[in-house]
C-alpha cells in the first residue's frame, strides 16, 4: 500500500495473507468459513511451492494469539483467467478446514448486486504489499482510503486505454494506491467487499494509472457455484 498507514490491529478480521513457502505473496479475503477469495495471477507466482493462508494476523512476523496458518485443500482459479490478461482475475482457495472464527477472524459480506459503485465513494484497501517505490515490505498490515473512479475516465487513452471492462472497477492512484503484494486483497466500500486487487504489473501511485479491481458482484454466479 502506497501513501497509506498502519491499520488498526485486527480491525479487518476478513484479511488474509496468501503465502508460499511461508512468505507473503498476495492478499486475500475470507468470504466464507472455509473459503478465501484472492487473485488468479497469484498462483502463477507460486510455482510449485506450498500455498497456505494466514488468518487473524496483523504482524506477519510476530506471534499473535489469533494468528493461524491454514493449508489449502483446493485452489480454484476462474476458468477464464489467463496469464496475459487481467480479465477474470479471481481465485478461490478452500482451506483444509473451517476457520476458527472470532473477533480477529470473520468472513466479509460480499456484494451480490451487480451495480457499479458510485464514483467518488471512498473505499478501503488493505494489504502487506510494498509501501515504497524502493520495494520496502511492511511487517504490519497497511490500509488506505481511495475514491472510486468512473470507468470512462479510467478507460481514457492516457489512463488504461479501454482495458477496463464492465467486470472491473477503478480507484484513484494519486500517490495513494495498492501495489505489488496487495494483489488479491479486498476493496471494501461501506463494509461490503466490492473489489479484489488485480495482479498485473501496473505502475503504482501514478494518477494516470488508476488501480484496477475485479468487481466481485459480476462474478456472483461463479463464486456461489464454487462455494455451494
Amino acid at each position: 500500500i502506497l501513501g497509506g498507514r498502519e491499520a488498526e490491529a485486527h480491525a479487518r478480521p476478513y484479511m488474509a495473507s496468501v503465502q508460499v513457502n511461508g512468505e507473503h505473496l498476495c492478499g486475500g479475503v475470507l468470504v466464507a468459513e472455509q473459503w478465501v477469495l484472492s487473485a488468479a495471477h497469484c498462483l502463477e507466482d507460486a510455482a510449485d511451492g506450498k500455498v497456505q493462508v494466514l488468518l487473524g494476523a496483523h504482524s506477519l512476523s510476530q506471534p499473535e494469539p489469533s494468528k493461524r496458518l491454514y493449508d489449502v485443500l483446493r485452489a480454484v482459479p476462474h476458468p477464464d483467467s489467463r496469464p496475459d490478461t487481467i480479465d477474470h482475475d479471481l481465485l478461490l482457495l478452500q482451506l483444509s478446514e473451517k476457520a476458527t472464527l472470532g473477533p480477529a477472524v470473520r468472513p466479509l459480506p460480499w456484494q451480490r448486486v451487480d451495480r457499479d459503485v458510485e464514483p467518488g465513494t471512498l473505499c478501503d484497501v488493505a494489504g502487506w504489499g510494498i509501501v515504497s517505490h524502493a520495494g520496502r515490505r511492511p511487517d504490519r498490515l497497511q490500509h488506505v482510503l481511495l475514491p472510486v473512479l468512473d470507468r470512462a475516465t479510467c478507460n481514457r487513452r492516457t489512463h488504461h486505454d479501454g482495458a477496463i471492462t464492465q467486470r472491473m472497477m477503478c480507484a484513484e492512484s494519486n500517490r495513494r494506491d495498492s501495489c505489488k503484494g496487495d494483489s488479491g486483497g479486498p476493496l471494501v466500500c461501506g463494509g461490503v467487499l466490492e473489489g479484489v486487487v488485480t495482479s498485473g504489473s501496473r505502475v503504482c501511485g501514478n494518477r494516470k494509472k488508476p488501480g484496477i479491481y475485479t468487481r466481485v458482484a459480476s462474478y456472483a454466479a461463479w463464486i456461489d457455484s464454487v462455494l455451494a
Epitope: P79, H88, S218, W222, S225
Partner: antibody, heavy 122, light 107 residues
Framework: QVQLQQSGAELARPGASVKMSCKAS????????IHWVKQRPGQGLEWIGY????????NYNQNFADKATLTADRSSSTAYMQLSSLTSEESAVYYC???????????????WGAGTTVTVSS | DIVMTQSHKFLSTSLGDRVSITCKAS??????VAWYQQKPGQSPDLLIY???TRHTGVPDRFTGSRSGTDFTLTISNVQSGDLADYFC?????????FGGGTKLEIK
C-alpha cells in the same frame, strides 16, 4: 444412481397456488444445490432460482421473486417450489435440476427431473 | 439480464451432414456457456459445458467453440437421433439465461 423425481401434473384455477416437489436420491441431499427452471409450451427455458439444502440459502431470478418460493426438507431429501397467484402465464413445465460436475464450478445442469406440468385454467 | 440469442429457430440438415447451431451473448460471459439437447416430451440433456467441454458419454461428433460473445455447437455426421431442440445457456451472471432454442430438422 443420482435421480430427481418430480411430483405429478397440477391443474389449478387462476389466483390459486400450487406446491410441487422434487425428491432426490442416489446422493447426499445436502451436497448439491437444487435449481428450478420453467419451460412454457414450445418455448425456451427460464431459470427461476435455487435453494442450497444444507443452508436453506435461496437465490431467485428477480422475475420470479414474488411468484416462487423455494424450500427444502432434509429429512425427506425433497425440495419444493410453491407458485402463488397463478395466471395463465404460469402454465408450463417446471424442472428441478442439479450440477454434479466434477469441476465443481459453474451453474450448468447435468441431472434434471422429468418435469411437473402446471395448467392454469378456469 | 444477459440475452442469449439463437438466431435460427429451425435448422434443416441431411443425415451425415455437419451442422452448426449458433448463440450470441448480449455481453461478455467468458466461456461460461453450456449446450443442451431436448427431445420432445423429455427433459434437457447436458451436452457441453464451459464452452468446449463435452459432458460424460456425449459423442465426439458434438463440439463447442467460441469467438468473443458468439458461441457455436457443431454436430458432425448428423444422425437421426440428433433431431431435437438445442439450447444454449450462460452461467456467467445472474440471472442464468437460456437461448430461445434451435430445432434441428431433416431436409
Amino acid at each position: 444412481q443420482v435421480q430427481l423425481q418430480q411430483s405429478g401434473a397440477e391443474l389449478a384455477r387462476p389466483g390459486a397456488s400450487v406446491k410441487m416437489s422434487c425428491k432426490a436420491s442416489g446422493y447426499t441431499f445436502t451436497t448439491y444445490t437444487i435449481h428450478w427452471v420453467k419451460q412454457r409450451p414450445g418455448q425456451g427455458l427460464e431459470w427461476i432460482g435455487y435453494i442450497n439444502p444444507s443452508s436453506d440459502f435461496t437465490n431467485y431470478n428477480q422475475n420470479f421473486a414474488d411468484k416462487a418460493t423455494l424450500t427444502a426438507d432434509r429429512s425427506s431429501s425433497t425440495a419444493y417450489m410453491q407458485l402463488s397467484s397463478l395466471t395463465s402465464e404460469e402454465s408450463a413445465v417446471y424442472y428441478c435440476a442439479i450440477r454434479l460436475g466434477y469441476d465443481r464450478q459453474g451453474w450448468y445442469f447435468d441431472v434434471w427431473g422429468a418435469g411437473t406440468t402446471v395448467t392454469v385454467s378456469s | 439480464d444477459i440475452v442469449m440469442t439463437q438466431s435460427h429457430k429451425f435448422l434443416s440438415t441431411s443425415l451425415g451432414d455437419r451442422v452448426s447451431i449458433t448463440c450470441k451473448a448480449s455481453q461478455d460471459v467468458g466461456s461460461a456457456v453450456a449446450w443442451y439437447q431436448q427431445k420432445p416430451g423429455q427433459s434437457p440433456d447436458l451436452l457441453i459445458y464451459w464452452t468446449f467441454t463435452r459432458h460424460t458419454g456425449v459423442p465426439d461428433r458434438f463440439t463447442g467453440s467460441r469467438s468473443g460473445t458468439d458461441f457455436t455447437l457443431t454436430i458432425s455426421n448428423v444422425q437421426s437421433g440428433d433431431l431435437a431442440d438445442y439450447f444454449c445457456q450462460q452461467y456467467s451472471n445472474y440471472p442464468l439465461t437460456f437461448g430461445g432454442g434451435t430445432k434441428l430438422e431433416i431436409k
